[in-house]
């Protein structure tokens, strides 16, 4: 690595990043025929343009605006599932409940999920060695700004009843510093969203506590209520059974509490 190259605290750009984004885009348009006319090369060009040749600590939402022009994908606004610190279960759920969507079920979310990327100021190079860490280096880095931008737009698009899956095994079930707590909660539109329904996912087999009474959930309820949106909360005591019952709702064991 040349001595002059900036060393950041976070991992570098995911290997084969351009190829991965392009391949994901093509795959997405094949899986979702309503996006069949999307030109993935143009999508990659816009994605690249957001961060290439720019200082990776000086990225703004404005940098992503050309790419966001593609974000007019019509996800049913009343079928949105948000999540915080429990991505895998949220994705397993929408894979079964095909008419509900997480951010990662949209094209832009699908393209970037689990990837890291950054460039270097004044060069067209992608930095595969290191990228800024949100805490140790800077918050205005390409990855953080991307997720903040798409998360805000996703929340703004939501209507009627919005669901959020929360991890009941964490010390802060609702974390104000998470993307959900810092971005999505504040961008739900009260004139469109009637209710936020939280699903608190229990971790332990024998955990029968009512986690909807957790202080952080009460804090979430307070924030939501102040925004003139109703709040409701459900405990999901057995996530494995919960998923099984989404798959087979007729199962006799699915009438009891899950």
């Amino acid at each position: 690595v040349p001595r002059w190259r900036q060393q950041w605290s976070g991992p570098g750009t995911t290997k084969r990043f351009p190829e991965t984004v392009l391949a994901r885009c093509v795959k997405y348009t094949e899986i979702h025929p309503e996006m069949r006319h999307v030109d993935c090369q143009s999508v990659w060009d816009a994605f690249k343009g957001a961060f290439i040749s720019k200082h990776p600590c000086n990225i703004t939402e404005e940098d992503y605006q050309p790419l966001m022009k593609l974000g007019t994908q019509t996800v049913p606004c009343n079928k949105i599932l948000l999540w915080s610190r429990i991505k895998d279960l949220a994705h397993q759920f929408t894979q079964v409940q095909r008419d509900m969507f997480t951010l990662e079920d949209t094209l832009l979310g699908y393209l970037a999920d689990d990837l890291t990327w950054c460039g270097e100021f004044n060069t067209s190079k992608i930095n595969y060695q290191s990228c800024p860490d949100w805490r140790k280096d800077c918050s205005n880095n390409p990855v953080s700004v991307f997720w903040k931008t798409v998360s805000r737009r996703f929340a703004e698009a939501a209507c009627d009843v919005v669901h959020v899956m929360l991890n009941g095994s964490r010390s802060k079930i609702f974390d104000k510093n998470s993307t959900f707590g810092s971005v999505e909660v504040h961008n739900l539109q009260p004139e469109k969203v009637q209710t936020l329904e939280a699903w608190v996912i229990h971790g332990g087999r024998e955990d029968s506590r009512d986690l909807c009474q957790d202080p952080t959930i009460k804090e979430l309820e307070s924030i939501i209520s102040k925004r003139n949106i109703q709040f409701s909360c459900k405990n999901i005591y057995r996530p494995d059974k919960f998923l099984q019952c989404v798959k087979n709702p007729e199962d006799s064991s699915c009438t009891s509490e899950i």
Epitope: E34, H37, V38, S42
Partner: antibody, heavy 118, light 110 residues
């Protein structure tokens, strides 16, 4: 080979209704998006409506939304366009077209003429 | 007024090269494939170019398509008398949730 044959065109008064049909053969009809495209006399091509494969989703041009309904019957290999509240400006040759996977209209019928006049 | 802008006419002598432009915006050409159709009066339109620059089988390689940003173009090299027709560009438009066609360009072989 692919064949698309439109029918149902004719002369109708303003405010009247007409139903166009398109009989498809030579491909797996249920797999493909289908569309209606029109050309008014002396004008260019104008997309009217599309219907998806599978559980049908429909798409309409602003100029016809609320008045026209596109539908399909996969069992009969047929595409339809129900046209209500017809206006003089709907006068055109209406083409039925098959969409391929990239969104292109690969195959077209010969068209059926709709004339809206009092 | 078409969403995609094309010149109304283009002409050239036999054997010449003619280029037709098609200008749009980020909501159509910018992020979506461009298609070109040839239309002879009294016949069904014919697909010439799909996915910006791909030719269906049977379309001569004299026809080529390209796209850059929010614009696209169709080039016809070695112009022949049978190329006299109307040519339309088309693309999906996100803001309209539907396809849009250009106003059409009439190509004349002098």
């Amino acid at each position: 080979q692919v064949q698309l044959v439109e029918s149902g065109g004719g002369l109708v008064k303003p405010g009247g209704s007409l139903r166009l049909s398109c009989a498809a053969s030579g491909f797996t009809f249920s797999d493909d998006y289908m569309s209606w495209i029109r050309q008014a006399p002396g004008k260019g091509l104008e997309w009217v409506a599309s219907v998806s494969s599978g559980r049908p989703t429909t798409y309409y041009a602003d100029s016809v939304r609320g008045r026209f309904t596109i539908s399909r019957d996969n069992a009969k290999n047929s595409l339809y366009l129900q046209m209500n509240s017809l206006r003089a400006e709907d006068t055109a040759v209406y083409y039925c077209a098959r969409e391929d996977w990239g969104g292109e209209f690969t195959d077209w019928g010969q068209g059926t003429l709709v004339t809206v006049s009092s | 007024q078409s969403v995609l802008t094309q010149p109304p006419s283009a002409s050239g002598t036999s054997g010449q090269r003619v280029t037709i432009s098609c200008s749009g915006s980020s909501s159509n050409i910018g992020f979506h494939f461009v298609y070109w159709y040839q239309h002879l009066p009294g016949t069904a339109p014919k697909l010439l170019i799909y996915k910006n620059n791909q030719r269906p089988s049977g379309v001569p390689d004299r026809f080529s398509g390209s796209k850059s940003g929010n614009s696209a173009s169709l080039a016809i090299s070695g112009l022949r008398s049978e190329d006299e027709a109307d040519y339309y560009c088309a693309a999906w438009d996100d803001s309209l949730s539907g396809y849009v066609f250009g106003s059409g360009t009439k190509v004349t072989v002098l």
